[in-house]
Amino acid sequence: IPLSRTVRCTCISISNQPVNPRSLEKLEIIPPSQFCPHVEIIATMKKKGEKRCLNPESKAIKNLLKAVSKERSKRSP
């Protein structure tokens, strides 16, 4: 559910569901700030541009972060 990014946290609920890295358009890791005291991970999916809040503590999501960072390091010269 959308809430103003500058005012507060964004995620009302979180998902533990595994996400296929290939289906990701973008992965945002938003660190704690004065606006939101929690880390929030927001995945933008290629299909319909759907955005999902992911559970930073979930094993599946931690694996996703590893896979994405590995993919990025491969691409960077």
């Epitope: 559910i1 959308p2 809430l3 103003s4 507060r8 946290c9 964004t10 995620c11 009302i12 609920s13 979180i14 998902s15 533990n16 939101c36 005291p37 929690h38 927001i42 759907e50 955005k51 999902r52 809040c53 992911l54 559970n55």
Partner: antibody, heavy 124, light 109 residues
Framework: QVQLVESGGGVVQPGRSLRLSCAAS????????MHWVRQAPGKGLEWVAV????????GYADSVKGRFTISRDNSKNTLYLQMNSLRAEDTAVYYC?????????????????WGQGTTVTVSS | EIVLTQSPGTLSLSPGERATLSCRAS???????LAWYQQKPGQAPRLLIY???SRATGIPDRFSGSGSGTDFTLTISRLEPEDFAVYYC??????????FGPGTKVDIK
């Protein structure tokens, strides 16, 4: 099975306080946003408050703002509603409800699981 | 704040008939943010439709939702005896605020 059970209702005098509880079971409570909704006798549904999975987001209906506080204890799988400065018009059945799939930003999945309700009567 | 109006207040129909319930918003509402609920006397509400047109788990296909902008509709194609109840529309608005309509009672003619 997925279940929500409210407790803490009763008869209370105007101006007094009451705390409602909602015990959740059968799902990962700490992943879900939660709501309180009330229904006055013979009337329709009125949304009261919402809290995000980690308590970072809270929202209230204008009618209860400044008097009611929603909170949760994820270690106990329990949702709370602290009601202060109670008025006769707060008399209602209070339901707790789970946000359907609030992880999907820009889409509202409704309240998909409801408790059976607990009755609050404010009367002198 | 967005206000939802439901009409008619009461709908008197016979089993087997089609029921059309209206929900009108005072300002435009994203169809992604509209839901419908059913409530029977002495029971908690039950989610029927979310996202204006998606049926919730276990809801029979005689229930359907449609609409956009300010006008939304819940249709029950053929009323079954268990469908006589009160129906509420609900919308999500930022802040976060969640608003219910006043309800439409569907009773037996």
């Amino acid at each position: 099975q997925v279940q929500l059970v409210e407790s803490g209702g009763g008869v209370v005098q105007p101006g007094r306080s009451l705390r409602l509880s909602c015990a959740a079971s059968g799902f990962t409570f700490s992943d879900y946003g939660m709501h309180w909704v009330r229904q006055a006798p013979g009337k329709g549904l009125e949304w009261v408050a919402v809290i995000s999975h980690n308590g970072a987001i809270k929202g209230y209906a204008d009618s209860v703002k400044g008097r009611f506080t929603i909170s949760r204890d994820n270690s106990k799988n329990t949702l709370y509603l602290q009601m202060n400065s109670l008025r006769a018009e707060d008399t209602a059945v209070y339901y707790c409800a789970r946000e359907g799939d609030g992880s999907n930003i820009y889409y509202y999945y409704g309240m998909d699981v409801w408790g059976q309700g607990t009755t609050v009567t404010v009367s002198s | 704040e967005i206000v939802l109006t439901q009409s008619p207040g009461t709908l008197s129909l016979s089993p087997g008939e089609r029921a059309t319930l209206s929900c009108r918003a005072s300002q435009s509402v994203s169809s992604s943010y509209l839901a419908w609920y059913q409530q029977k006397p002495g029971q908690a509400p039950r989610l029927l439709i979310y996202g204006a047109s998606s049926r919730a788990t276990g809801i029979p296909d005689r229930f359907s939702g449609s609409g956009s902008g300010t006008d939304f509709t819940l249709t029950i194609s053929r009323l079954e005896p268990e469908d006589f109840a009160v129906y509420y529309c609900q919308q999500y608005g930022s802040s976060p605020i969640f608003t219910f309509g006043p309800g439409t009672k569907v009773d037996i003619k």
